[in-house]
């Protein structure tokens, strides 16, 4: 959950307590286990070649 007093993150991003900033939900494809991805509606799966080149 976003820290008190923090401005809400813009559309397409979510608050990361670990990194102490808003992060792009798009990066959840590459880093799905990041804390901020829980706040993203849906983390799209990585293309096959990105996961298993």
């Amino acid at each position: 959950e976003q820290a008190p007093g923090q401005a809400p993150c813009s559309r397409g991003s979510s608050w990361s307590a670990d990194l102490d900033k808003c992060m792009d939900c798009a990066s959840c494809r590459a880093r799905p286990h990041s804390d901020f991805c829980l706040g993203c509606a849906a983390a799209p799966p990585a293309p096959f070649r990105l996961l298993w080149p």
Epitope: G12, L19, M23, D24, C25, A26, S27, R29, A30, R31, H33, A42, P44, P47, R49, L50, P53
Partner: antibody
Framework: EVKLEESGGGLVQPGGSMKLSCVAS????????MSWVRQSPEKGLEWLAE??????????HYAESVKGKFTISRDDSKSRLYLQMNNLRAENTGIYYC??????????WGQGTTLTVSS | DIVLTQSPASLTVSLGQRATISCRAS??????????MQWYQQRPGQPPKLLIK???NLDSGVPARFSGSGSGTDFTLNIHPVEEEDAATYYC?????????FGGGTKLEIK
């Protein structure tokens, strides 16, 4: 202040080997994917190799042009990135940049180190 | 591999006007939600610097006169109003799959 500093470039003869090094500071090195990117007048910017995190078992990925010739590695305890290059050829000449990204983009760049492969 | 074609190769823009740079990918680099395209600025003698990630998202500290748009195969970097310090070469880069590739660059000159 984020800083990436490459070293190890220079002149090497065709067929020779070279190991590049990069020391990082100012960010959480062990939480960043690290890559090497080469720049040359002939081929422009070329991504060469990437190494991910300990939690990814330090997974590595390579451009086809360097697969089997170059080896990327990292030492999180020293915040260092390496590139071992073997069987070098003239087309490997260029500026080698150490880069770091939280994910699949390049947030941070070093100033680069120049490698010249020539006899 | 995905090929990124930038146009024009060079352009000259008057101070305060708009610069528009295009990048076309040989295949789509977008999902229904996100586009996996970045833009970098490289000034002479310097390394590239990240400007925009995921097609539209400005990196921290990048002036709001820079903006990115596009999806699928066609992407655009706009700079408005152009300032003298924007004289540089601009590159697109996809992260749809490995290998990541860069465009050939667009050199922007200011008059």
């Amino acid at each position: 202040e984020v800083k990436l500093e490459e070293s190890g470039g220079g002149l090497v003869q065709p067929g020779g080997s070279m190991k590049l090094s990069c020391v990082a500071s100012g960010f959480t090195f062990n939480n960043y994917w690290m890559s090497w990117v080469r720049q040359s007048p002939e081929k422009g910017l070329e991504w060469l190799a990437e190494i991910r995190l300990k939690s990814d078992n330090y997974a590595t990925h390579y451009a086809e042009s360097v697969k089997g010739k170059f080896t990327i590695s990292r030492d999180d305890s020293k915040s260092r990135l390496y590139l071992q290059m073997n069987n070098l050829r003239a087309e490997n000449t260029g500026i080698y940049y150490c880069t770091g990204g939280f994910a699949d983009y390049f947030d941070y760049w070093g100033q680069g180190t120049t490698l010249t492969v020539s006899s | 591999d995905i090929v990124l074609t930038q146009s024009p190769a060079s352009l000259t823009v008057s101070l305060g006007q708009r610069a528009t740079i295009s990048c076309r990918a040989s295949q789509s680099v977008s999902t229904s939600s996100y586009s996996y395209m970045q833009w970098y600025q490289q000034r002479p003698g310097q390394p590239p610097k990240l400007l925009i990630k995921y097609a539209t998202n400005l990196d921290s500290g990048v002036p709001a006169r820079f903006s990115g748009s596009g999806s699928g195969t066609d992407f655009t970097l706009n700079i408005h109003p152009v300032e003298e310090e924007d004289a540089a070469t601009y590159y697109c880069q996809h992260s749809w799959e490995i290998p990541y590739t860069f465009g050939g660059g667009t050199k922007l000159e200011i008059k």
